[in-house]
Interface confidence: low
């Protein structure tokens, strides 16, 4: 269900380049594809090549992203290009000045001294952002949002963005500073990982993050049920980054359980993080349990 | 505070080798960026090139990518620059600067240290 | 690579002038651009970055300006400690080229 043509505007249009760049990355670290046939692999790097390049056009001169070239960039898509983009570095030749240039500016341009990284044109589509959506912890959710982003960025882009070091640590101090203050478990869960990706969730700040699970196993607030898989993915990678493999199985199954395959409307960030999660167990995870996910690739026709 | 301490005066036969460290101190080490910059005497300067410290990770200005080679070692807090094949061309003071604020620039600058070739 | 053209190369002021120096890129860098001022014998010393933030401790009286291609710095009522080269310096793909610099005087 997750190989997709991507179109329309810069919003839409990595709508449809997530869930082919997040299946591809999933069955080439599970090693499936021979389920597939290999020739499924190259059409759907195709349709990445498509959705990059397609991306490009929504690229503004200061490097930023925004749904229309006229438009006031967006501090969230920009991070999230740079997030897919990271991911997609390894699949389809990605232009580093293209990644490193929207990297540039979000440290440049949309963090505030304090570490906080600001939006000042949020997205059209809102259903694109998860559970960052009406979030009411937004300076904790976005800045952990976007620093995830940038750590995933920083291998590819810490020699031309200089500052990249220093901006990844101040995000991470405001994080720390507020996250014992935190009310949301989605919200601890994503700004969890990206502590735990800087070897910051300790201490307390972990006994919140491991205490605020429900019975052990999910991440979870009233409503959304796809915000709830997004917050548990986020969560699950906090746990792989910890080594904590006590707490995983429990989680794992629970994520498993969802049968929660991606697609549909609003679906971009769960579609995103579980299998970034899923992929990133069956990779860290010592003798861990097959997980039979029904991952059905369907190339669009032409 | 940050410093960024170089050793000291060479004088180097052409042909040989050469190599200067900066040892820093005040900070963490491996969330800072080195770069090292040349100045001919009388003259401007030069972006020689930058390495992460944490990563190892360098990149070079091309005019310099035969004749300089950047290392760093976390546990000494010391980052290198070995010139080689020296000539009277590579006659300069030759200076590490560090990173780590927002600045997209050189905060903090070692003291130089002057590399002299002659027979 | 991107050429970095500082004008003038030099230039003699008095204490309590104001000068002006520019810097002009071959290409767009957008606001990563930096000044630092090196005083005879001794490293150079970080002024401003990102076109027009001073850096900690630079006095109010040096300020810095413009986008994309053309850049000033600019230095109300000269002080004696002001003299020196200042060199312009891009932070816009490697590698992150200087200006010629300009050397400012005492009249």
């Known amino acids: 269900h997750l190989i997709v043509t991507p179109s329309g505007c810069g919003e839409q249009n990595m709508i449809g380049m997530t869930p082919t760049v997040i299946a591809v990355h999933y069955l080439d670290e599970t090693e499936q594809w021979e389920k597939f046939g290999l020739e499924k692999r190259q059409g759907a790097l195709e349709l990445i090549k498509k959705g990059y390049t397609q991306q490009l056009a929504f690229r503004q001169p200061s490097s930023a992203f925004a749904a229309f070239v006229k438009r006031a960039p967006s501090t969230w898509l920009t991070a999230y290009v740079v997030k897919v983009f990271s991911l997609a570095v390894n699949l389809i030749a990605i232009d580093s000045q293209v990644l490193c240039g929207a990297v540039k500016w979000l440290i440049l341009e949309k963090q505030k001294p304090d570490g906080v990284f600001q939006e000042d044109a949020p997205v059209i589509h809102q259903e694109m952002i998860g559970g960052l959506r009406n979030n009411n912890e937004k300076d904790m959710a976005l800045t952990a949002f976007v620093l995830i982003s940038l750590q995933e960025a920083k291998d590819i882009c810490e020699e031309q963005v200089n500052s990249l070091p220093g901006s990844i640590t101040k995000a991470g101090d405001f994080l720390e500073a507020n996250y014992m203050n935190l009310q949301r478990s989605y919200t601890v869960a994503i700004a969890g990982y990206a502590l735990a990706q800087m070897g910051r969730l300790k201490g307390p700040l972990l006994n919140k993050f491991l205490t605020t699970a429900k019975d052990k196993n999910r991440w979870e607030d009233p409503g959304k049920q796809l915000y709830n898989v997004e917050a548990t993915s986020y969560a699950l990678l906090a746990l792989l980054q910890l080594k904590d493999f006590d707490f995983v199985p429990p989680v794992v199954r629970w994520l498993n359980e969802q049968r929660y395959y991606g697609g549909g409307y609003g679906s971009t960030q769960a579609t995103f993080m579980v299998f970034q999660a899923l992929a990133q167990y069956q990779k860290d995870a010592p003798d861990h349990q097959e997980l039979n996910l029904d991952v059905s690739l369907q190339l669009p026709s032409r | 505070q940050v410093q960024l301490q170089q050793s000291g005066a060479e004088l180097v036969r052409p042909g040989t080798s050469v190599k200067v460290s900066c040892k820093a101190s005040g900070h963490s080490f491996t969330n800072y960026l080195i770069e090292w910059v040349k100045q001919r005497p009388g003259q401007g300067l030069e972006w020689i090139g930058v390495?992460?410290?944490?990563?190892?990770?360098?990149n070079y200005n091309e005019k310099f990518k035969v004749k300089a080679t950047l290392t760093a070692d976390k546990s000494s807090s010391t980052a290198y620059m070995q010139l080689s094949s020296l000539t009277s061309e590579d006659s300069a003071v030759y200076f590490c600067?560090?990173?780590?604020?927002?600045?997209?620039?050189?905060?903090?600058w070692g003291q130089g240290t002057s590399v002299t070739v002659s027979s | 690579d991107i050429q970095m053209t500082q004008s003038p190369a030099s230039l003699s002021a008095s204490v309590g002038e104001t000068v002006t120096i520019a810097c002009r890129a071959s290409e767009n860098i957008y606001s990563y651009l930096a000044w630092y001022l090196q005083k005879e014998g001794k490293s150079p010393q970080l002024l401003v970055s990102?076109?027009?933030t001073l850096a900690d401790g630079v006095p109010s009286r040096f300020s810095g300006g413009g986008s994309g291609t053309q850049f000033s710095l600019k230095i109300n009522s000269l002080q004696p400690e002001d003299f020196g080269t200042f060199y312009c310096?891009?932070?816009?793909?490697?590698?992150?080229?200087f200006g010629g610099g300009t050397k400012l005087e005492i009249k």
């Open positions: 600067a560090s990173y780590y604020s927002n600045s997209y620039a050189m905060d903090y």
């Open positions: 310096q891009h932070h816009y793909g490697i590698p992150y080229t």
């Open positions: 390495i992460n410290p944490g990563s190892g990770g360098t």
């Open positions: 990102k076109a027009k």
